[in-house]
């Protein structure tokens, strides 16, 4: 049995059907929905036999409908059940409000039943203008939206409708006035130079698309200089200005075609930077050094002119980078006054010229070449020279006789002395000295030097020869020898050699105690640190022993007799006579005689008595050989 058909509204555009029927009896149900006034054709729906309820959407609002249903069982239709019902009223929008107003946008809020609308249609229209409205749609789920892109300080009428399929609500409207465009903040000039300035300004972040800066010379009708800069900037360098010039600088912000009121500032650029403090100092004898002061990073280049004071025609020009503040000017004449001028160039402008005068130093000199500490194989050189100029000195050593190869030395220009060694002894040399500087070789100066002779050992002399010795003397260089060795050997090599070591200051040796009348060889060697010279040699014969001879007796008397003898002249200091009777009956008689005597009368003897007589000479305390004789006194 199909029964209990009930129809209820589902919102304003649908109905809900419920019915009862035996389970599993129906193949399907046929439902027919038709406006009660039958304006439009009926809608038929076939639903499965298992259903007991169905929603019928897409109906018109506030419209009465007739709904019929029957079931189909194995091809048979059940009786039709019918019912009447009306759809609900169309839902309306609630209220619309402007929540936030800016100068270029606003926020719109509204209320509406949930799920009632597919979308909302919003229209934004400038009031009192015929300009086309801005239209936009927003999803039916939203209750708020931003409306950007508006004009500042402008009246707008905003309407909103809810829309669903073929239905649109009554519009709601609101009027609003957008705010004024925000003003710029402060405009300041933070840095001023002679050709540029820096602008700083304040403004709300993110407000402006761009800023326009206008730079105009004050009191000039010349075209202004316009710059457009991004809206993110708050600072800008304005280059390319004239020095010492007043400027008016204006700034305004731009946003979507709107310009703020301009800000303006007046400023005067600084005067063109000047060069200052030009100082010129000498750099040696062939150059000058320039130093000057100037503003940093100001100059493209400097132009320097260098001119001899007394020669107007020949000037030297140099162009230098603007970063320099000093320069060396080489290649000038020594001891010469120069005028130096400098100016700077800044983007084609020339600064006033600065000038100074200075003289180069005298040409470097060398002099006073002196030779000292001469040895047999070396000497020292010293000289004077201008300090800090010379790179090297050249020394040439030439022997005066041109027998040896010339020796050349190159030494550092800082030196003022040199030790020259490896030379031959007893040689005359000429020493030439010249100095070399980067662009000069001085005139050569010279000196002479003679190396010492090798130490000498010479002139071995034998003197004071006597029977018992002699004196050895020699010559030797001062301080050349530590010691001398004198060796004395008898010619027959029968005796051991005698060696005498003497200090290096001695030049003489007296030899005594030698054998009379034989040959000797004398050798003298010098020693230096144990090294022996080849000896000097001499041969000598000692004198024979001096003799007393020819003792004669004459003129015998009863009490005496006369004695006479011969002896070498000049040898004896005195003579000694000894007289004694041969029988030794009386005391002996001893008489000492002076050297010149060669005779002596002897008295006081006994008559007719035989006497023994002995005679010897004394020379330097030594006795000669004795001579003897027998004499007899006469009878009385």
């Amino acid at each position: 049995e199909l029964e209990n058909l009930t129809v209820t509204e589902v919102g304003w555009d649908g109905l809900r059907l419920n019915w009862t029927a035996a389970d599993q009896a129906y193949e399907h149900f046929i439902i027919q929905v038709q406006e009660a006034n039958k304006v439009e054709a009926a809608r038929n729906l076939t639903v499965p036999g298992s259903l007991r309820a169905v929603d019928i959407p897409g109906l018109k609002a506030a419209t009465p409908y007739t709904v019929s249903i029957y079931g189909v069982i194995q091809g048979y239709r059940t009786p039709v059940l019918s019912a009447e019902a009306s759809t609900g009223e169309t839902p309306n929008l609630g209220e619309v409000v402007v929540a936030e107003v800016g100068w270029d946008a606003l926020k719109l809020n509204w209320t509406a039943p949930e799920g009632a609308y597919e979308y909302f249609f919003i229209q934004v229209q400038e009031a009192d203008t015929v300009e086309a409205a801005q239209n936009l749609t927003v999803p039916g789920g939203l209750r708020s939206t931003d409306l950007p892109g508006l004009k500042a300080a402008t009246h707008y009428t905003i309407t909103i409708r809810g829309v669903t399929q073929d239905f649109s609500t009554t519009p709601l409207s609101v009027e609003v006035l957008t705010e004024e465009v925000p003003d710029m903040g402060n405009l300041t000039v933070t840095e001023v130079s002679w050709d540029a300035l820096r602008l700083n300004w304040t403004t709300p972040d993110g407000t402006y698309d761009q800023f326009t800066i206008q730079v105009q010379e004050a009191d000039q009708v010349e075209e202004a200089h316009n710059l457009t800069v991004p809206g993110s900037l708050r600072s800008m360098e304005i280059p390319g200005l004239r020095a010492g010039t007043p400027y008016t600088v204006t700034l305004h912000g731009e946003v979507r075609g709107h310009s703020t009121r301009p800000l303006a500032v007046e400023v005067v650029t600084e005067d063109l930077p000047q060069l200052g403090d030009l100082a010129v100092s000498e750099v040696g004898w062939d150059g000058l050094r320039l130093n000057w002061t100037a503003a940093d990073n100001a100059y493209e280049h400097f132009v320097i002119q260098v001119q001899e004071v007394n020669k107007v025609e020949a000037a030297q020009n140099l162009t230098l980078p603007g970063s320099l503040r000093a320069v060396d000017i080489p290649g000038l004449e020594a001891a010469t006054p120069y005028r130096v001028s400098i100016y700077g160039v800044i983007r084609g402008y020339r600064t006033p010229v600065l000038s100074a005068e200075a003289s180069t130093a005298k040409e470097p000199e060398i002099g006073n070449l002196n030779v000292s500490d001469i040895t047999p194989e070396s000497f020292n050189l010293s000289w004077m020279a201008t300090d800090g100029i010379f790179e090297t000195f050249t020394i040439e050593i030439i022997d005066s006789n041109r027998l040896l190869e010339t020796v050349e030395y190159n030494i550092s220009g800082a030196e003022r002395t040199a030790h020259i060694s490896g030379l031959p002894p007893s040689t005359d040399f000429i020493v030439y000295l010249s100095g070399l500087a980067p662009s000069i070789r001085t005139k050569t100066i010279s000196a002479t030097a003679t190396t010492e002779a090798l130490p000498l050992l010479e002139n071995l002399t034998i003197s004071d020869i006597n029977p018992y010795g002699f004196t050895v003397s020699w010559m030797a260089s001062e301080n050349a020898f530590d010691s001398f060795l004198v060796t004395v050997v008898d010619s027959g090599k029968l005796l051991d050699p005698q060696e005498f070591t003497l200090s290096g200051t001695q030049r003489k040796l007296e030899l005594r105690g030698l054998i009379t009348g034989i040959g000797y060889e004398v050798m003298v060697s010098g020693f230096t640190q144990g090294h022996q010279t080849k000896p000097l040699r001499a041969e000598i014969v000692t004198e024979a022993e001096p003799e007393v001879d020819n003792l004669l007796v004459s003129d015998a008397t009863p009490d005496g007799f006369r004695l006479s003898w011969t002896a070498d002249e000049g040898v004896f200091d005195n003579f000694v006579l000894k007289i004694r009777d041969t029988k030794k009956q009386s005391e002996p008689l001893e008489i000492t005689l002076l050297a010149p005597e060669r005779t002596r009368d002897i008295t006081g003897l006994r008559e007719a008595t035989e006497y023994e007589i002995e005679l010897y000479g004394i020379s330097k305390g030594r006795r000669s050989q004795t001579v003897s004789a027998i004499a007899t006194t006469a009878m009385g």
Epitope: S378, P455, L456, D482, F527, G530, H531, T533
Partner: antibody, heavy 118, light 108 residues
Framework: EVQLVESGGGLVQPGGSLRLSCAAS????????MGWVRQAPGKGLEWVSA????????YYADSVKGRFTISRDNSKNTLYLQMNSLRAEDTAVYYC???????????WGQGTLVTVSR | SSELTQDPAVSVALGQTVRITCQGD??????ASWYQQKPGQAPVLVIY???SRPSGIPDRFSGSSSGNTASLTITGAQAEDEADYYC???????????FGGGTKLTVL
């Protein structure tokens, strides 16, 4: 038996100093002149310095004058060589040697190596 | 010059006589001394003065001098005589000791 034993050699930087010693035995030290001779690697002998018996007279080669000082202590039978301002060219084996009054160096030590290098 | 000049190298057959020379101005006045030096060893005095030998030096070593030249002669050279030989003299008070450059003697 005559013995001369050197010590004090080693590695030193240019400009540095070293003091060499030579201990003597087996002869009358105070009666002998003493000296130093050096030999650079692969080179010949070069006399350096000498001193007389009592130490009052000293002698130097030009190449070391003003930088080296020879001295002796007869009570300790020791000879010294103080080497200052050393140069690379001073690198050598340094021999101590003795000589009696009328002979050159007749006894030598075995030497001590001095190396002057950075 | 003041230097003493030696030949850098000399060779001799075993048992033969060899003469090593030394030249220099100082040798006009001084006798030369001669030293033998074997590798890794200290020098040894072999001749001094006119031709004196220290004790222990064989008599095959002798010295002579003429003018500015000094000579060391080894009569009947032995294998053990292979060594460097240095002459040595004085040049006066300022250069009390000078050495020659040395001669390397090879015994074949």
């Amino acid at each position: 038996e005559v013995q001369l034993v050197e010590s004090g050699g080693g590695l030193v930087q240019p400009g540095g100093s070293l003091r060499l010693s030579c201990a003597a035995s087996g002869f009358t030290f105070s009666g002998s002149r003493m000296g130093w001779v050096r030999q650079a690697p692969g080179k010949g002998l070069e006399w350096v310095s000498a001193i007389n018996e009592e130490g009052g007279q000293t002698y130097y080669a030009d190449s070391v004058k003003g930088r080296f000082t020879i001295s002796r202590d007869n009570s300790k039978n020791t000879l010294y060589l103080q080497m200052n301002s050393l140069r690379a060219e001073d690198t050598a084996v340094y021999y101590c040697a003795k000589h009696p009054p009328h002979r050159p160096f007749d006894y030598w030590g075995q030497g001590t190596l001095v190396t002057v290098s950075r | 010059s003041s230097e003493l000049t030696q030949d850098p190298a000399v060779s001799v057959a075993l048992g033969q006589t060899v003469r090593i020379t030394c030249q220099g101005d100082s040798l006009r006045l001084y006798y030369a001394s001669w030293y033998q030096q074997k590798p890794g060893q200290a020098p040894v005095l072999v001749i001094y003065g006119k031709s004196s030998r220290p004790s222990g030096i064989p008599d095959r070593f002798s010295g002579s001098s003429s003018g500015n030249t000094a000579s060391l002669t080894i009569t009947g050279a032995q294998a053990e005589d292979e060594a460097d030989y240095y002459c040595n003299s004085s040049h006066g008070p300022r250069r009390p000791v000078v050495f020659g450059g040395g001669t390397k003697l090879t015994v074949l």
